[in-house]
Interface confidence: medium
């Protein structure tokens, strides 16, 4: 079993390398930035062009753009749960910094969390999101 | 208050059959994850068994899957284990566990225990 | 079944502080949320720290838990006569499919 456990580090390791999770992280920050923005604006001012798209709609589009490129890599790790969740992982420390607050944090998490049921993968059952708790191992 | 309440246990033959019950009040049964941990004499706390809210996924400890069965009745707000092919080794006290895990990304925490009940497998 | 290593016994005097530590590999620990327990000689374990860090209402912030990488560690601080059990960690492996918990840690306060 210790045999194998190591085969599948290094295999992880090496999808995880091989992996660009860049768009995955592009994709998140302008989900809860837009959500952001649809809470914080004021219902009742008027758009200063009917006609013209709002950004969000620009936004939204670049935004799925992101999300097909972040699903077909995380479809490299469709079979190995544990791999997703340090693709999961990883994400989430590339994107630890650029979040403000606690709140950013939480909502980041939480898109972070359905991200692999929003592209029709399997989500790993469990998985640790905290980037507080010390640098991983990575084998 | 949420309270466990275990029945079951006591003295069977290798090779004989159990079943525990764990009884639960207090809090809402269903939407509680439900394990079994066992601790036998003198030793360590060694997980058995968990269930998901619904039934639908099960988790057993490898030497006793295909002989122990864990389901439970949403209704009855009760959580069973089946014991069957009893051994030696699974003699210990049988704890049933509520865990607080409400979303499948939490930790599997126990945050709520039975009284526990005594298994003895032997001749 | 692989286990959660801790170590056997600790001691202190009242009023100080220990830590216990609880190392893993990267299927567990490494992945997983790590939740502490307290087992006062004869009855059922009690729930200390879940999610790593977290305390469950009722358990005083004398008890605190961390994690980094493949290890976890319990730290009690203001040590009671009272701490006198046994502790374990617990976490999920996803290789095994299994909840592990550690091979306990006896705490003996002197004195």
């Known amino acids: 079993r210790q045999q194998w456990e190591l085969q599948g580090d290094r295999r992880c390791q090496s999808q995880l390398e091989r992996a660009n999770l860049r768009p995955c992280e592009q994709h998140l920050m302008q989900k809860i930035q837009r959500d952001e923005d649809s809470y914080g604006r004021d219902p009742y001012s008027p758009s200063q062009d009917p006609y013209s798209p709002s950004p969000y709609d620009r936004r939204g589009a670049g935004s799925s753009q992101h999300q097909e490129r972040c699903c077909n890599e995380l479809n490299e790790f469709e079979n190995n749960q544990r791999c997703m969740c340090e693709a999961l992982q990883q994400i989430m420390e590339n994107q630890s910094d650029r979040l403000q607050g606690r709140q950013q944090e939480q909502q980041f998490k939480r898109e972070l969390r359905n991200l692999p049921q929003q592209c029709g993968l399997r989500a790993p059952q469990r998985c640790d999101l905290e980037v507080e708790s010390g640098g991983r191992d990575r084998y | 208050q949420v309270q466990l309440v275990q029945s079951g246990g006591g003295l069977v033959q290798p090779g004989g059959s159990l079943r525990l019950s764990c009884a639960a009040s207090?809090?809402?049964?269903?939407?509680?994850?439900m394990t079994w941990v066992r601790q036998a004499p003198g030793k360590g706390l060694e997980w058995v068994s968990n269930?998901?809210?619904?039934?639908?996924?099960?988790d057993y400890l490898d030497s006793v899957r295909g002989r122990f069965t864990i389901s439970r009745d949403n209704s009855k707000n009760t959580l069973y284990l089946q014991m069957n092919s009893l051994r030696a080794e699974d003699t210990a006290v049988y704890y049933c566990?509520?865990?607080?895990?409400?979303?499948?990304?939490?930790?599997?925490?126990?945050?709520?225990w039975g009284q526990g009940t005594l298994v003895t497998v032997s001749s | 079944q692989s286990v959660l290593t801790q170590p056997p016994s600790v001691s202190a005097a009242p009023g100080q502080k220990v830590t216990i530590s609880c190392s893993g590999t990267?299927?567990?620990?490494?992945?997983?949320?790590v939740s502490w327990y307290q087992q006062l000689p004869g009855t059922a374990p009690k729930l200390l720290i879940y999610?790593?860090?977290k305390r469950p209402s009722g358990i005083p912030d004398r008890f605190s838990g961390s994690k980094s990488g493949t290890s976890a560690t319990l730290g009690i601080t203001g040590l009671q006569t009272g701490d006198e059990a046994d502790y374990y960690c617990?976490?999920?492996?996803?290789?095994?499919?299994?909840?592990?918990f550690g091979t306990g840690t006896k705490l003996t306060v002197l004195g």
């Open positions: 617990a976490t999920w492996d996803a290789d095994l499919s299994a909840v592990l």
């Open positions: 207090g809090f809402k049964f269903s939407t509680f994850y």
């Open positions: 566990a509520a865990n607080g895990l409400q979303d499948s990304y939490s930790g599997d925490f126990f945050d709520h």
């Open positions: 269930i998901k809210q619904d039934g639908s996924e099960k």
């Open positions: 990267g299927s567990n620990i490494g992945h997983n949320y």
């Open positions: 999610d790593n860090t």
